[in-house]
């Protein structure tokens, strides 16, 4: 089989601070040295890019400075964290993995992680 399998959790609940973390694991058919990981958000059949990072195997995952994502890599596993989430960001977050180099190129698309975000209740004023 030439397809690359990508696994990610079905559901994740964001913290009260709007932070969600999940693991994206891929079964590499080859020995890739350069990997690109992209987080996509799917809502109403529209797909948008949340963040992306390219890394060399054995090196750290580096997202752009203004990215809402951070992550670490270990072998064929990527630990992703998305920050600054609000209730309106609740949705399906898909992990996309591309083995860029060396040939052949492989594409792997996860089934998506449903991230639920609940905005924290504002603290009531204290009466003393």
């Amino acid at each position: 089989c030439k397809a690359m399998h990508v696994a990610q959790p079905a559901v994740v609940l964001a913290s009260s601070r709007g932070i969600a973390s999940f693991v994206c694991e891929y079964a590499s058919p080859g020995k890739a040295t350069e990997v690109r990981v992209t987080v996509l958000r799917q809502a109403d059949s529209q797909v948008t890019e949340v963040c992306a990072a390219t890394y060399m195997m054995g090196n750290e995952l580096t997202f752009l400075d203004d990215s809402i994502c951070t992550g670490t890599s270990s072998g064929n596993q990527v630990n992703l964290t998305i920050q600054g989430l609000r209730a309106m960001d609740t949705g399906l977050y898909i992990c996309k993995v591309e083995l860029m180099y060396p040939p052949p190129y492989y594409l792997g698309i996860g089934n998506g992680t449903q991230i639920y975000v609940i905005d924290p209740e504002p603290c009531p004023d204290s009466d003393f």
């Epitope: 030439k2 397809a3 948008t48 890019e49």
Partner: antibody, heavy 118, light 108 residues
Framework: EVQLVESGGGLVKPGGSLRLSCAAS????????MHWVRQAPGKGLEWVSF????????YYADSVKGRFTISRDNAKNSLYLQMNSLRAEDTAVYYC???????????WGQGTMVTVSS | EIVLTQSPATLSVSPGERATLSCRAS???????LAWYQQKPGQAPRLLIY???SRATGIPDRFSGSGSGTDFTLTISRLEPEDFAVYYC?????????FGQGTKVEIK
């Protein structure tokens, strides 16, 4: 408007060279991989070449390897295909296509005709 | 290289009827990585189906895709006059990216 527009096609003699361009607009060009696909007269679609987001990774069909070079300029939202040592069998309509976020080629240009003949 | 074989080469159907197109892969293709395109004379291909069964934006629901592994199907439930065209399947899960040879759907 989200679109791709190819240019640079024409008539060239065998052994000659041609450079195709593809101008992208209406989307963040650097967030997508890009491809060239060709179609010989009356024939099916044949993938020609791929280029990664930053242009560092390139792949080619065996039929064009060593003769064609793909490149991109993200600052100019442009994709290119440099075609050298052209042969009669390279005669085709050449399309640039966007590798969609989920992988399929979700946006195509209108195509540019390349004819290799003496 | 994954070779995609489409059948039949030509399908003659009357408007309003159902059309069933087949695409067989030489080795297993993950269902997430199989697409169908429509091409009309003088036009560029247009994405219809991706991920074997998901309709692309703006594609009417008379088009549906199914299948997994090595066997995939594109079904057009009720052919409209504008549906007569050539249809290609494609795998995009690994390089080289490959297309089937196409199925021409013509008016009977």
């Amino acid at each position: 408007e989200v679109q791709l527009v190819e240019s640079g096609g024409g008539l060239v003699k065998p052994g000659g060279s041609l450079r195709l361009s593809c101008a992208a607009s209406g989307f963040t060009f650097s967030s997508y991989t890009m491809h060239w696909v060709r179609q010989a007269p009356g024939k099916g679609l044949e993938w020609v070449s791929f280029i990664s987001y930053d242009g560092n990774t390139k792949y080619y069909a065996d039929s064009v390897k060593g003769r064609f070079t793909i490149s991109r300029d993200n600052a100019k939202n442009s994709l290119y295909l440099q075609m050298n040592s052209l042969r009669a069998e390279d005669t085709a309509v050449y399309y640039c296509a966007r590798g969609g976020l989920l992988g399929p080629f979700d946006l195509w240009g209108q195509g540019t005709m390349v004819t290799v003949s003496s | 290289e994954i070779v995609l074989t489409q059948s039949p080469a030509t399908l003659s159907v009357s408007p309003g009827e159902r059309a069933t197109l087949s695409c067989r892969a030489s080795q297993s293709v993950g269902s997430s990585y199989l697409a169908w395109y429509q091409q009309k004379p003088g036009q560029a291909p247009r994405l219809l189906i991706y991920g074997a069964s998901s309709r692309a934006t703006g594609i009417p629901d008379r088009f549906s895709g199914s299948g997994s592994g090595t066997d995939f199907t594109l079904t057009i439930s009720r052919l409209e006059p504008e549906d007569f065209a050539v249809y290609y399947c494609q795998q995009y899960g690994s390089s080289p990216w490959t297309f089937g040879q196409g199925t021409k759907v013509e008016i009977k």
